[in-house]
């Protein structure tokens, strides 16, 4: 999913059906003055960045696992 500039939300689209084994780390951004929505940005093991749907139960599980493993910020 394309990442926009920091002056607004970064996630224009979210990626569906990503596997936990492909994810290196996850960054979760809370709403702020630049963006009204929660954003989940995954760094994949191949170096690419991908936006995930924060409302998806699968993504919530990924965040929980990453938090346990210390791979989320």
């Amino acid at each position: 999913a394309p990442l926009a500039t920091e002056l607004r939300c970064q996630c224009l689209q979210t990626l569906q059906g990503i596997h936990l084994k492909n994810i290196q780390s996850v960054k979760v951004k809370s709403p702020g003055p630049h963006c009204a929505q929660t954003e989940v940005i995954a760094t994949l093991k191949n170096g690419q960045k991908a936006c995930l749907n924060p409302a998806s139960p699968m993504v919530k599980k990924i965040i929980e696992k990453m938090l346990k493993n210390g791979k989320s910020n």
């Epitope: 607004r8 939300c9 809370s30 709403p31 929505q37 924060p54 409302a55």
Partner: antibody, heavy 118, light 109 residues
């Protein structure tokens, strides 16, 4: 279609508290922060604060830190704002407002008139 | 607390271009102030127009655009229409959103 439906008008006595609601529909409630804004004397707007339902985190305008309490009920997709120790200066129309990808204040509720009078 | 100042009223005609501005008491408005523009029509009907200085909200006509002009944030309506008659508020971010007093825009036929 995004909709924010606010509760009806309130008439309260000085010193009382009031809790107003904003029921959201047409989107995934937890993903977007909910702002609260007030309009006094039919003109100026003041930002009260914001509630992030995803992490249950609030941000307040310092002016309203001791006046307003923002909460949500995720199960009913409803945001609430409680105002305490009301004075005549709190008489205003209060709005909830949700953002979009582009802007913080994209979608607004219809407003709730709060009148504080002895 | 910073003060945000707008023109109190402006008048334009259909088809004309009009620019509303938003000044900060703390100095030049920058992209870090994340300027937002909101339209108010009668009966408390609010609609967000612009966020992050120049990002148009969903469904907002292309004639509305946001920018920085000199030391101010600006909302330009290119080819104003009678339905654009409204009050326009800007909001700037400091450590909270601070709204200006609003500009009443009249579109005279």
């Amino acid at each position: 279609e995004v909709q924010l439906q606010q509760s009806g008008p309130e008439l309260e006595k000085p010193g009382a508290s009031v809790k107003i609601s904003c029921k959201a529909s047409g989107y995934s409630f937890t993903v977007y922060g909910m702002n609260w804004v007030r309009q006094s004397n039919g003109k100026s707007l003041e930002w009260i604060g914001n509630f992030d339902p995803y992490f249950s985190v609030t941000s307040y305008n310092q002016k309203f830190q001791d006046k307003a309490t923002l909460t949500v009920d995720k199960s009913s997709s409803t945001a609430y704002m409680q105002l305490k120790n009301l004075t005549s200066e709190d008489s205003a129309v209060y709005f909830c407002a949700r953002g979009s990808w582009e802007t913080i204040f994209a979608y607004w509720g219809q407003g709730t008139l709060v009148t504080v009078s002895a | 607390q910073a003060v945000v100042t707008q023109e109190s009223a402006l008048t334009t005609s259909p088809g004309e271009t009009v620019t509303l501005t938003c000044r900060s008491s703390t100095g030049a408005v920058t992209t870090s102030n994340y300027a937002n523009w909101v339209q108010e029509k009668p009966d408390h009907l609010f609609t967000g127009l612009i966020g992050g200085t120049n990002n148009r909200a969903p469904g907002v006509p292309a004639r509305f655009s946001g920018s920085l002009i000199g030391d101010k944030a600006a909302l330009t309506i290119t080819g104003a229409q009678t339905e654009d008659e409204a009050i326009y508020f800007c909001a700037l971010w400091y450590s909270n959103h601070v709204f200006g007093g609003g500009t009443k825009l009249t579109v005279l036929q």
